[in-house]
């Protein structure tokens, strides 16, 4: 397995522990969602990553101004996404780069599922079923 | 002891079986146990479900219903060492879409 596909709960520095919640969010399009990470904030800064599929490598999340916001209050870091869209679907990870070792640690990830009908075809199919 | 990443969620239709893997790198006879956390509720302690079945520690839930929803977490322990825990997989139970009223075979239609 690739190194990014495995993790352990290390007994090393406090930086090596990062807890993420929730594991899964399903919300309708247009709603606001929040995901949280708890870590030793003194150990290093937190950034957010995103990947669309389970088997992909996570990429740095490009924060959309006015719609996506990251905040941190001591040990608690929060990512807020407003007006969620279908293209927001995927798994979000918080990541901390340790100040002293420059090692990188990730949370377990939060999967976001945006509910509703994403295409005209899906909507038509639903109407056909209703008819 | 390494735990490999597991899917964040698994969608299973009502009445089907759910299979959860617990991939880890232990070559010894590791003890694999399964636990369930009610999503968003953070009950303590998590509900103990039992041991894993095969060498991979698989958990199978047969005939899934809505009450089975939640986060399924496996713990792997070698000897007296502290356990390692998977990130957990959220089980989503899907109600199959209702069959349309006019969903009949071609033979029936032509009668």
């Amino acid at each position: 397995a690739r190194s990014e596909d495995r993790y352990r709960n290390p007994k090393g520095s406090a930086c090596s522990r990062i807890w993420q919640s929730p594991r899964f969010i399903a919300r309708k399009r247009g709603f606001t969602v929040k995901m949280h990470c708890y870590m030793n904030s003194a150990s290093g800064n937190v950034s957010w990553l995103w990947k669309q599929e389970m088997d992909e490598n996570p990429q740095q999340l490009k924060l959309e101004k006015g719609r996506m916001e990251e905040s941190q209050n001591e040990s608690l870091a929060t990512l807020t996404i407003q007006g969620i869209r279908f293209e927001d679907n995927g798994i979000y990870f918080c990541q901390q780069k340790c100040n002293n070792t420059s090692e990188v640690y990730q949370g377990c990830g939060t999967e976001l599922r945006v509910m509703g009908f994403s295409t005209l075809a899906q909507l038509k199919q639903r109407n056909t079923l209703k008819d | 002891l390494w735990m490999h990443k597991v899917p964040a969620s698994l969608m299973v239709s009502l009445g089907e079986d759910a299979h959860f893997q617990c991939p880890h790198n232990s070559s010894n006879n590791a003890n694999v146990t399964w636990w369930r956390v009610l999503h968003g509720n953070y009950t303590w302690p998590p509900e103990f479900l039992g041991p894993g079945e095969d060498p991979n520690g698989t958990l199978i839930i047969q005939n899934v219903n809505k009450s089975h929803g939640g986060i399924y977490v496996c713990r792997v322990q070698e000897g007296n060492e502290s356990y390692q825990q998977s990130c957990g997989t959220y089980l989503r139970v899907r109600q199959p879409p209702p069959r349309p009223f006019l969903d009949m075979g071609e033979g029936t239609k032509n009668r």
Partner: nanobody
Framework: DVQLQESGGGLVQPGGSLSLSCAAS????????RAWHRQAPGKQRELVAA???????MYADSVKGRFTISRDNAKTLVSLQMDSLKPEDTAVYYC??????????WGQGTQVTVSS
């Protein structure tokens, strides 16, 4: 809102022990993280130890092997057993809890002084 109250602080000699407790004013909602932070004079507040809803723990390097965090579901939400105390452990210790929705609550703090 959940009101938190710490207790158990005091003056102790180097090498001694103390046990801190954190109680809630009302029955608290389900909690994701329960933690202890501390703030020494002239320094920033820092994480000491935390425990989550899975029972996993995290400790600051400086207290590993000396401090033990534990949780309870009754009125006492979280405790911190501090052994082999050192003068550098002198600080105000704060209880901190986080709900699954990310609401964060803090106690008023309890003073711990390690001095001979």
């Amino acid at each position: 809102d959940v009101q938190l109250q710490e207790s158990g602080g005091g003056l102790v000699q180097p090498g001694g022990s103390l046990s801190l407790s954190c109680a809630a004013s009302m029955s608290s909602p389900s909690l994701w993280v329960r933690a202890w932070h501390r703030q020494a004079p002239g320094k920033q507040r820092e994480l000491v130890a935390a425990i989550n809803s899975d029972g996993q723990t995290m400790y600051a390097d400086s207290v590993k092997g000396r401090f033990t965090i534990s949780r309870d579901n009754a009125k006492t939400l979280v405790s911190l057993q501090m052994d082999s105390l050192k003068p550098e452990d002198t600080a105000v210790y704060y209880c901190n809890v986080v709900t699954p929705r990310g609401q964060q609550y803090w106690g008023q703090g309890t003073q711990v002084t390690v001095s001979s």
